[in-house]
Structures are given as structure tokens and as C-alpha cells.
Interface confidence: medium
């Protein structure tokens, strides 16, 4: 039985030109995470696996960071990284996990921030 | 464009070992992961295990483990399947394929394959 | 591990012909959170590698013809060949890689009359 819960930053905002944190959180079950998966729509964006360590999608090396924790850092944000983003963790015996976050990326330099993982 | 050379066939003896390699080229060696798939003649795909060429780590099919050992060399951008212990059961093509990023975990460019035949 | 089962083992059908092969997992491949179903489908000619044609259980891979259809959710896919050529004689495997490791059904093989 899946008894765990995943929180996220939920629905984030964030300046064009700027930095975010993608953020998620597996709590209540003692399954262990053996691995995560940072996707964007059709496009994985990387992995953290307990053996394999990180690995960034060569399509967004240039600009994404892994960390902090099981976190992924978006750098260099573009209008076009508007959209929904997934946290997937794998984990034994649960199965996955899914957490889902929005991230809209503002044109104004006066962008909203609510989100408690987001970079000042 | 992407190639993935494989190695030679090879006989060999019933409980030593072989090394198959896979040079990568025409891509950033460490940008994606290596798998290994083991074809025994006229049988279906199994599934190895998986080097991350970045960092050396692996995540091996439990099947596997104790039998192959996955290793990658950056500077030759080569990745390596040791095959110990042989027996008859391991005489099989063994094909590498590099990770494939669409969201998902696929095997769009293989190597042509290395037939590995274990015959006193 | 996940289970794939494929049927049936081997189908001979006359080009032209439409042909349909079934893939089911012991567990589900859908991800629930984004809709994802992690199922993929290769063709495997005699002597080669095998190709992906499909992946995300319906999604065609670039360059793959259109009469090549996946379907299906959860634990049962099917591959349909909608009208079958003489170049399609070959293996088709369905391939989990929702969870490791990644399994990889027994094949379906396509004869052509």
C-alpha cells in the first residue's frame, strides 16, 4: 500500500533571465527513493539514481543544475520554461510517486514570489 | 552522427573471462548512458544494467550482478562489459545502446552487436 | 521484476494485411501523475539491432512509417501494423522501462506470405 505523500512548491513564478528551485518532498513511508526523475512535459530533464548519481539531459546541460538535495536549479529561464513540471520518484517497495509543479516564467521584472525553495 | 562500435567476436573458454568494448563517438561521450542488452541465439532482449560514462556509476539487473562488470574510459570515450565465469549460458550477441531523452529511458542508437561464444 | 507478456509467439499474414500483437505487464506502466504510460516498441530484423519504433506506449518514433500504431494503458498495448510490406518481416519486442530493471517481452515474430 502507498502511504506516501509528496509535497512541492506547487505554482511558482519566476523572472526571465533568472534562477528557480524545483522542489519536491516524499514524506510518510519508509520506502527508499531509488531514483528520481525531473521531466518536462515530453522531455526528461535529468535523473538522480542511488547508483547511477546525477545525470542532466545533454539538451539542457547548459542550464540546469542538479541539487539542492533530490532538487533540480533551472538557470537562464526563458519564457518557453513555462509549463508543468514533474518530480517522479522511484522508490522499493511503494512503486512512484509523482509530484507535480507550475512554473510560469514572467517577462515582467516585477515577478510574484510565493514559493519557499525559490532562489531570491 | 552517433556510432557505437562494438568489438569482435570472441571465442572462449568455459570459466574465463571476456571484455567486450563499445566506442562511442560522433556525441559527448559523458552526455548519455551506456546499457548493455545480452540475445542469447534465437531468444528474446535482456536487460544488463547501465553506466553513467560521467561518473562511473552503475545500476546492474540483480540477474547480472557477480557476472558482468560495467566500466566506461572518458578519455577514450569507451565503454566496457567484463563477462566473468563463463559458461554456456553466457554464449550470446551482447549489444550496448545509448540512452535515449524523451521523458524516457529508451535505446535509439545500438551497437551492431558482439557475439561472445563459450565452447570448450 | 515486471512481467511482459507477448502474444501471439509468432503471426504470418500476406502484405497488404492488417496485423495487430498484444503486449500485457504484470504491472501497471502508467504513471498516474503524468499520464506517461512507459512502454515501448522495437523491430528487430534478422542480423541487426534492434530499432524503437514506439515509445510512451503510443508515440512513433521520428522516421518510423505511420501504418506502425501503438495503443493501450496501463497493462495492456498492442502494436498494430496496419498494412503489412514485405520489409516488415522481423521481431517486435514490447519493452518496459517504467521501473529496473527494464524488461523486455519474449517477441512477437511477423512472417510475411
Known amino acids: 500500500m502507498m502511504t506516501g505523500t509528496i509535497e512541492t512548491t506547487g505554482n511558482i513564478s519566476a523572472e526571465k533571465g533568472g534562477s528557480i528551485i524545483l522542489q519536491c518532498h516524499l514524506s510518510s513511508t519508509t520506502a527508499q527513493v531509488t531514483q528520481v526523475n525531473w521531466e518536462q512535459q515530453d522531455q526528461l530533464l535529468a535523473i538522480c539514481n542511488a547508483d547511477l548519481g546525477w545525470h542532466i539531459s545533454p539538451s539542457f546541460k547548459d542550464r540546469v543544475a542538479p541539487g539542492p538535495g533530490l532538487g533540480l536549479t533551472l538557470q537562464s529561464l526563458t519564457v518557453n520554461d513555462t509549463g508543468e513540471y514533474f518530480c517522479i520518484y522511484h522508490t522499493y517497495p511503494d512503486g512512484t510517486y509523482t509530484g507535480r509543479i507550475f512554473l510560469e516564467v514572467l517577462e515582467s521584472s516585477v515577478a510574484e514570489h510565493g514559493a519557499r525553495f525559490q532562489i531570491p | 552522427q552517433v556510432q557505437l562500435q562494438q568489438s569482435g567476436a570472441e571465442l572462449v573458454r568455459p570459466g574465463t573471462s571476456v571484455k567486450v568494448s563499445c566506442k562511442a563517438s560522433?556525441?559527448?561521450?559523458?552526455?548519455?548512458?551506456i546499457e548493455w542488452v545480452k540475445q542469447r541465439p534465437g531468444q528474446g532482449l535482456e536487460w544488463i544494467g547501465v553506466?553513467?560514462?560521467?561518473?562511473?556509476?552503475?545500476k546492474y539487473n540483480e540477474k547480472f550482478k557477480g557476472k558482468a562488470t560495467l566500466t566506461a574510459d572518458k578519455s577514450s570515450s569507451t565503454a566496457y562489459m567484463q563477462l566473468s565465469s563463463l559458461t554456456s549460458d553466457d554464449s550470446a550477441v551482447y549489444f550496448c545502446a545509448r540512452y535515449h531523452y524523451y521523458g524516457s529511458n529508451l535505446f535509439p542508437y545500438w551497437g551492431q552487436g558482439t557475439l561472445v561464444t563459450v565452447s570448450a | 521484476d515486471i512481467v511482459m507478456t507477448q502474444s501471439p509467439s509468432s503471426l504470418s499474414v500476406s502484405a497488404g494485411e492488417k496485423v495487430t500483437m498484444s503486449c500485457k505487464s504484470s504491472?501497471?506502466?502508467?504513471?498516474?501523475?503524468?499520464?506517461?504510460?512507459?512502454l515501448a516498441w522495437y523491430q528487430q530484423k534478422p542480423g541487426q539491432p534492434p530499432k524503437l519504433l514506439i515509445y510512451?506506449?503510443?508515440t512513433r518514433e521520428s522516421g518510423v512509417p505511420d501504418r506502425f500504431t501503438g495503443s493501450g494503458s496501463g497493462t495492456d498495448f498492442t502494436l498494430t501494423i496496419s498494412s503489412v510490406q514485405a520489409e516488415d518481416l522481423a521481431v517486435y519486442y514490447c519493452?518496459?522501462?517504467?521501473?529496473?530493471?527494464?524488461?523486455f517481452g519474449s517477441g512477437t515474430k511477423l512472417e510475411v506470405k
Open positions: 504491472q501497471s506502466l502508467l504513471n498516474s501523475g503524468n499520464q506517461k504510460n512507459y
Open positions: 553506466i553513467n560514462p560521467g561518473s562511473g556509476g552503475t
Open positions: 519493452q518496459n522501462y517504467h521501473s529496473y530493471p527494464f524488461t
Open positions: 560522433g556525441y559527448d561521450f559523458t552526455d548519455y548512458l
Open positions: 510512451g506506449a503510443s
